[in-house]
């Protein structure tokens, strides 16, 4: 699986998970949440050549089809697969609100 | 919805679902299917900018990080969100066989 | 590298007031949030509050409620801290701690301060 | 606030032991959890932040686990330099209180 065990222990090129710190405030201009400061969401990059995590059978059609035609912009991309929430603190008047945001964290990523 | 009705009647820049016709020889190397020859499989394309179609939490997250950081590798990415089957015809020995391949037309796109 | 350089020891009579300084450099000063925490003498550490320079957002620990102000002037990449009507359990070492990924990564020298009539 | 109570307040070891120390929050700080280690008259060093990550130049014989409530420093091989006294902070939600110190 292109998951952070694997993709953050190797130096793969092909499409896998990346890391990635975003700051609420200055990478966003959050100010709402008031914990944490900022987490680490990570990010899908890579090329997605044929056989390599693929989809459904349209994303293998596209990347064979993109083997046999290499200067055409029809290719599969890198993108999430498996998310996970972040817990978060925010204020509603003076009162602390813990909640849960979903989808939010990117464990794994898929060619599609 | 970034589907066909509405990206191939306009000439929308961002994200949206493209007309891309495959030949299965010419541009898959498939000489196993008997009919059809090839087929309107489309492709999605364009950029994904904050709010155009995304599609969880963690797509709007890294839209604006996008937005406040413009030179960043990290973006969300244009691929299939509605896909349909393809009825296609193949041979075992002298015998015809139908069978419906599944996820291979795209009807829609999606920022992910 | 990332450096934050405070002020020296201070000597103040009590109900008098310190200001203490913390430059910094090697780092992005105005987005990153800035902590002020104190260690009294033989004691663990106290954490006293925050500010983010880029827009003079504070947080305080309510225990220092009125009596202590943080500021950041983004001219000369400095953070100050100021504490009012000193008393002798406010005796200790003040450290500006850069706020850095759930943690406090990069630390001032610390900055003594002695209350004493 | 949320209190940490850090044990054991003192401990003596020996090098090439094992050393285990925990931190306890009061209520559910997730991962949100920093240790540092301070040697006397110096200012402290981040260890390990958000739980478990190692800090940059941190010997990999230093690791952190837990979360929710429960945390623990462990030094798999103890050092003759590793001799300090080490700090919890949890960073959920402020004030951002401190360990009492092992």
């Known amino acids: 699986a292109l998951d952070t065990n694997y993709c953050f222990s190797s130096t793969e090129k092909n499409c896998c998970v990346r890391q990635l710190y975003i700051d609420f405030r200055k990478d966003l201009g959050w100010k709402w949440i008031h914990e944490p400061k900022g987490y680490h969401a990570n990010f899908c990059l890579g090329p997605c050549p044929y056989i390599w995590s693929l989809d459904t059978q349209y994303s293998k059609v596209l990347a064979l089809y993109n083997q046999h035609n290499p200067g055409a912009s029809a290719a599969p991309c890198c993108v999430p697969q498996a998310l996970e929430p972040l817990p978060i603190v925010y204020y509603v008047g003076r009162k602390p609100k813990v909640e849960q945001l979903s989808n939010m964290i990117v464990r794994s990523c898929k060619c599609s | 919805a970034l589907d066909t009705n509405y990206c191939f009647s306009s000439t929308e820049k961002n994200c949206c679902v493209r007309q891309l016709y495959i030949d299965f020889r010419k541009d898959l190397g498939w000489k196993w299917i008997h009919e059809p020859k090839g087929y309107h499989a489309n492709f999605c394309l364009g950029p994904c900018p904050y709010i155009w179609s995304l599609d969880t939490q963690y797509s709007k997250v890294l839209a604006l990080y996008n937005q406040h950081n413009p030179g960043a590798s990290a973006a969300p990415c244009c691929v299939p969100q509605a896909l349909e089957p393809l009825p296609i015809v193949y041979y075992v020995g002298r015998k015809p066989k139908v069978e419906q391949l599944s996820n291979m037309i795209v009807r829609s796109c999606k920022c992910s | 590298q990332v450096l934050l350089v405070q002020s020296g020891a201070e000597v103040r009579k009590p109900e008098a007031s310190v200001k203490i300084f913390c430059k910094a450099s090697g780092y992005s000063f105005t987005s990153s949030w800035m902590n002020w925490v104190r260690q009294a003498p033989a004691q663990g550490f106290e954490w006293m509050g925050q500010?983010?320079?880029?827009?003079?957002?504070?947080n305080y620990n309510g225990k220092f409620k009125g009596r202590l102000t943080l500021t950041a002037d983004t001219s000369t990449n400095t953070a100050y801290m100021e504490l009012s009507s000193l008393r002798s359990t406010d005796m200790a070492v003040y450290y500006c701690a850069r706020h850095y990924d759930g943690s406090t990564d990069y630390w001032g020298q610390g900055a003594l301060v002695t209350v004493s009539s | 606030e949320i209190q940490m109570t850090q044990s054991p307040s003192s401990l003596s070891a020996s090098p090439g032991d094992r050393v285990t120390i925990t931190c306890r929050a009061s209520e559910n700080i997730y991962s949100n959890l920093a240790w540092y280690q301070q040697k006397p008259g110096k200012v402290p060093k981040l260890l390990i932040y958000?739980?478990?990550n190692l800090a940059d130049g941190v010997p990999s014989r230093f690791s952190g686990s837990g979360s929710g409530t429960d945390f623990t420093l462990t030094i798999s091989s103890l050092e003759p330099e590793d001799a300090a006294t080490y700090y919890c902070q949890h960073f959920w939600g402020t004030p951002y209180t401190f360990g009492g110190g092992t």
């Open positions: 500010i983010y320079p880029g827009d003079g957002d504070t």
């Open positions: 958000a739980a478990t």
